[in-house]
């Protein structure tokens, strides 16, 4: 190796200056005694190198790039060799930003997978490899005092969410949770959440069903629908409130919301609808009065309201 580049820093803030030095050893005798060292950033020659012979006979060129505006580029030092450039050495330069503070950290407890799933927004692109780590600890109080640390949760590349498995959770006890972002230019931490996993529980929705008509029950009135729902069994002991939404299948009508309904109602007569009209209905529930997240909307149920009962003048015969 005839030449060697060293740089002030291989990774810098985007737009910051960078200084590089290229040294050519004396024993590269096939070279000119006074070779002119050239610099290239990517494909572009860079002027401004200051060259000197050192006391040991080596040649050194120093260049300062006033603003590194490429997020990634190769800097090389070279010599003219015949009609071509002979590259002596090259280094990869990277430029970007330290990680912004991750924001909008939120979590939900999935009782089926027995895990606490947390997600966040990573902030603007840093242009550098940036790692995110979900960090947490158990706390007996309001997270002012730290208890046992929980194993770090590292998301898969490019993902902004991570799942803490049940073995690291304590239900009905607070946890401190935050996201740490780190790259070559710095580290940042999100504000800390303090939560009991049960307070962010997200239930599965009930299953909507048509109410079986019983012989003694009156049929639904015109513009009414009778429906029932089967609660999600594993969430049955959690007090909840629910809400229905409905819209006519045809047309561009938006959803109309009905609620709150107690989960225990299990059946409901919905009135004030258009007669002889097909409706789409869905239900969702939330832990209540204790905190929780709304479930997803249930799969749709499609029902048709009955015809309006004929009024007296409809009985007249038209000849």
């Amino acid at each position: 190796e005839c030449g060697h580049i060293s740089v002030s820093a291989p990774i810098v803030h985007l737009g910051d200056p960078i200084t590089a030095s290229c040294i050519i050893k004396q024993n590269c005798s096939h070279l000119d005694p006074e070779p002119q060292i050239l610099w290239r950033l990517g494909a572009e020659l860079q002027p401004g190198g200051r060259q000197q012979r050192l006391s040991d006979g080596t040649q050194e060129s120093i260049i300062t790039l006033p603003h590194l505006n490429h997020t990634q580029a190769f800097l090389s030092c070279a010599l003219n060799w015949g009609n071509s450039l002979q590259i002596l050495d090259q280094v990869e330069l990277r430029a970007g930003y330290p990680p912004a503070i991750p924001h909008n950290l939120s979590c939900l407890m999935n009782l089926t997978t027995s895990s606490l799933i947390c997600q966040w927004e990573p902030g603007p692109e840093t242009h550098l490899p940036t790692s995110f780590t979900l960090k947490s600890f158990k706390s007996r109080g309001n997270c002012q005092t730290q208890g046992d640390s929980i194993l770090d949760c590292v998301p898969k590349d490019g993902q902004s969410h991570c799942s803490i498995p049940r073995k690291h959770l304590l239900l009905y006890q607070n946890m401190g949770i935050w996201v740490q972002a780190e790259n070559a230019l710095g580290t940042s931490m999100s504000p800390q959440l303090c939560l009991d996993p049960m307070d962010v529980v997200k239930l599965e929705p009930p299953m909507l069903r048509t109410m079986d008509p019983s012989p003694e029950a009156a049929p639904p009135q015109a513009g009414c629908l009778q429906l029932s729902w089967e609660p999600w069994q594993p969430g049955l002991h959690i007090n909840q409130k629910c809400e229905l939404r409905h819209k006519p299948q045809r047309g561009e009508a938006s959803w109309a919301l009905v609620g709150p309904l107690p989960l225990e109602a299990l059946q409901y007569e919905l009135c004030g609808l258009l007669p002889a009209t097909a409706y789409t209905l869905q239900i969702r529930c939330i832990r209540w009065p204790l905190p929780g997240h709304w479930s997803d909307w249930s799969p749709s149920l499609e029902l048709r309201t009955t015809e309006r009962a004929p009024t007296h003048h409809h009985h007249h015969h038209h000849h």
Partner: antibody, heavy 118, light 107 residues
Framework: EVQLLESGGGLVQPGGSLRLSCAAS????????MGWVRQAPGKGLEWVSS????????PYADSVKGRFTISRDNSKNTLYLQMNSLRAEDTAVYYC???????????WGQGTLVTVSS | DIQMTQSPSSLSASVGDRVTITCRAS??????LNWYQQKPGKAPKLLIY???NLQNGVPSRFSGSGSGTDFTLTISSLQPEDFATYYC?????????FGGGTKVEIK
Amino acid sequence: EVQLLESGGGLVQPGGSLRLSCAASGFTFSLYWMGWVRQAPGKGLEWVSSISSSGGVTPYADSVKGRFTISRDNSKNTLYLQMNSLRAEDTAVYYCAKLGELGWFDPWGQGTLVTVSS
Amino acid sequence: DIQMTQSPSSLSASVGDRVTITCRASQGISSYLNWYQQKPGKAPKLLIYYASNLQNGVPSRFSGSGSGTDFTLTISSLQPEDFATYYCANSWGYPLTFGGGTKVEIK
């Protein structure tokens, strides 16, 4: 301190009836599911019935369905189990218990013995 | 109905021993598995809920693990007051079902 106190057990003839009560204190009774679990002499635990916080949902074990009725009076903080058409195999200690949100029983009452025998 | 199978039905152990009791559900129940301890003439007492959560006041030598169909209760170092019968119970859905029990006796 959460406390549950059962009463109403005793000796009854086959085909007879009995009503068990469970007085609750130390927690907001109206917010919790409650349940009955029984244990025949020398045997394991068997769930009998549960009731939702406002009484609208009342699942039963197949072995007692149609014969037993669970109910509650939230104004009196009391849980009941009305047992009709009693059989010898209903002989057991009956425990009332508070149900946790994910379906565990805690705490339990001290139990009341029901003996069905002629 | 979900059947809960506990093993062994009884075991003899000495103070200081590590004891493991297993419970198998006939179908997946996620983490809806609870463990109870019962001493003769007394009401059962909750030890572990939702498979691995230690109930308040229960010594840390008790631990629970597993999910789906296979669960374990471990007593890391058996103490004299731990000789009792242990039951697992499913709370995934009705009917709620108990295992047959494991009686832990003094060797």
